[in-house]
Interface confidence: low
């Protein structure tokens, strides 16, 4: 049968906690022995671990309230897939019975003495009551027993005297409006109310007492908002040190709105909490050097050879660059001033060529002039000779890459009457005017 499966079993209460879901078998639920299950909602919770006895329940109340009785307690075999000690199946209850005694003896009733004399009338004018009493000692009760009935009785009595009427206050009148609309100002706000000694007035014959207390009262007004306190600036703090070691910097002074702090909706201090000043170190800042762009590669040559052009003979070439702009002990340029590489010279070499595909369209030229056009080209591209791409120039220094250098003379079949470049031009459409963006903002 399907069961409700839970993720926890609470040992102290025997309850299932953390519902995982219903409609699963006991076997599937108990794949995790930390889980627990119920056969129906609110039913007995059984843990999935191997069966063992629960803790003993508390002792039930004693079967009688006085003299000797007995009381029960139980424990249950809880768990799954096994038995508790004594070969007992899960769900089985085991009982213990012990003697108990809440009170050694049982209560016994007592008996009343005779009524005592009537006490004086409870009032000195008009009508009241008088009382008489009796004692529960004839005989006295035992073991917490009592006597049946009342220990005193009362009856009406009449003094035959007219009572004076004492004054009593009528209800308080309304509170007057507060003397101020907020508290914490120069005058503490108060409200006042009064009342009359007329509910009733004191009688003249026989004379009644006047009303006790005062005919008016005052109190501090509650619930009023505190009076607003406007904020005030404290003094300017010290000027901060100049934060730079060269050129111009900015120092700052600060002040705090705490003289006093604004309170209860009072306005914050007007003006700025900080002010700044320029500070001048009178020291020029260092300027780091920056490399110019590389110069042109020198011609590709080989020492002791007049020309290596159009031959499978590797040579060397170099290019240089200049470190510019270093001043005031700035950093020198990092890296090499000269670059050397190995090369094959194809300067002015007649090479077989082939026409390239069309290039992408270029930019519109002139960008701000009349009738700008864009162009694309097909170029007669030389087919480079299949010389070795790396060479070993010096024993033990490994292979070096070799680059082709120079402008060859490619030979292509004529295309549209051209031998080197075929160009196609088109006008650019819907051309916007060139305007200085700075001027546009103004």
């Amino acid at each position: 049968d399907p069961v409700l499966c839970f993720t926890q079993y609470e040992e102290s209460s025997g309850k299932c906690k953390g519902l995982l879901g219903g409609g699963v078998s006991v076997e599937d639920c108990c794949l995790n022995t930390a889980f627990a299950y119920q056969k129906r909602s609110g039913g007995l919770c059984q843990p999935c671990r191997s069966p063992r006895w629960s803790l003993w329940s508390t002792w039930a109340p004693c079967s009688v309230t006085c003299s000797e009785g007995s009381q029960l307690r139980y424990r249950r075999c809880v768990g799954w897939n096994g038995q508790c000690s004594g070969k007992v199946a899960p769900g089985t209850l085991e009982w213990q019975l012990q003697a108990c005694e809440d009170q050694q003896c049982c209560p016994e009733m007592g008996g009343w003495s005779g009524w005592g004399p009537w006490e004086p009338c409870s009032v000195t004018c008009s009508k009241g009551t008088r009382t008489r009493r009796r004692a529960c000692n004839h005989p006295a009760p035992k073991c917490g027993g009592h006597c049946p009935g009342q220990a005193q009785e009362s009856e009406a009595c009449d003094t035959q005297q007219v009572c004076p009427t004492h004054g009593a206050w009528a209800t308080w009148g309304p509170w007057t409006p507060c003397s101020a609309s907020c508290h914490g100002g120069p005058h503490e706000p108060k409200e006042t109310r009064s009342r009359k000694c007329s509910a009733p007035e004191p009688s003249q014959k026989p004379p009644g007492k006047p009303c006790p207390g005062l005919a008016y009262e005052q109190r501090r007004c509650t619930g009023l908002p505190p009076c607003p306190v406007a904020g005030g600036w404290g003094p300017w703090g010290p000027v901060s040190p100049c934060p730079v070691t060269c050129g111009l910097g900015q120092t700052m002074e600060q002040r705090t709105c705490n003289h006093p702090v604004p309170q209860h909706g009072g306005p914050f201090c007007a003006g700025d909490a900080t002010r700044t000043h320029i500070c001048n170190t009178a020291v020029p800042c260092p300027v780091d050097g920056e490399w110019d762009s590389w110069g042109e590669w020198s011609p590709c040559i080989r020492r002791n050879m007049k020309s290596i052009s159009c031959q499978e003979i590797p040579g060397q070439q170099s290019r240089g660059r200049t470190c510019r702009g270093r001043k005031f002990d700035g950093h020198r340029c990092a890296g090499q001033q000269q670059d050397i590489r190995h090369c094959y010279s194809i300067q002015h070499c007649p090479l077989k060529g082939s026409w390239s595909e069309w290039s992408t369209w270029g930019l519109c030229m002139p960008p701000c002039g009349p009738n700008p056009t864009r162009a694309r080209q097909r170029l007669c591209t030389p087919l480079l000779p299949k010389y070795p791409p790396t060479v070993s120039m010096v024993e033990g220094q490994g292979e070096k890459n070799v680059t082709f250098w120079g402008r060859p003379l490619p030979r292509c079949e004529e295309l549209q009457g051209q031998k080197l470049v075929v160009e196609e031009k088109r006008p650019c459409l819907h051309v916007p005017a060139c305007k200085d963006p700075e001027e546009e903002e103004l």
């Epitope: 926890q8 299932c16 519902l19 879901g21 909602s41 609110g42």
Partner: nanobody, 129 residues
């Protein structure tokens, strides 16, 4: 066993209000946690609101906070959903659900439809633009 019947649905203009009721049969209504869920047309069922057996803890979906209020009257065996400032996206079939409180461990469970054993047949709420 608890039997749940929803009522109070209908057609209302955007910005209007409706009050849904869910009447439960059974003497132990006060020991059940109650939830409202909704299923918009063509979408999955969504959690709306839930209330514990005593009403001491209440949970709402973010999409309806401040507009819908869940409450219960254990003497009348009824849970209510007061819906104000209704929007066209509130259009859905609204379902009432119940589960014995002992089965729960925290707010996460109240927001999962699978946590509830008993469901009503639903009431249609349509909000026109």
């Amino acid at each position: 066993q608890v039997h749940l019947v929803e009522s109070g649905g209908g057609l209302v203009q955007a910005g209007g209000s409706l009050r849904l009721s869910c009447a439960a049969s059974g003497r132990t209504f006060s020991s059940y946690a109650m939830g409202w869920f909704r299923q918009p047309p063509g979408k999955e069922r969504q959690f709306v609101a839930a209330i514990t057996w005593s009403g001491s803890s209440i949970y709402y979906a973010d999409s309806i906070k401040g507009r819908f209020t869940i409450s219960r009257d254990n003497a009348k065996n009824t849970v209510y959903l007061q819906m104000n400032s209704l929007k066209p996206e509130d259009t859905a079939v609204y379902y009432c659900a119940a589960e014995e409180t002992s089965a729960y461990s925290g707010s996460y469970y109240y927001m999962m439809g699978d946590s509830y054993s008993y469901w009503g047949q639903g009431t249609q709420v349509t909000v026109s633009g």
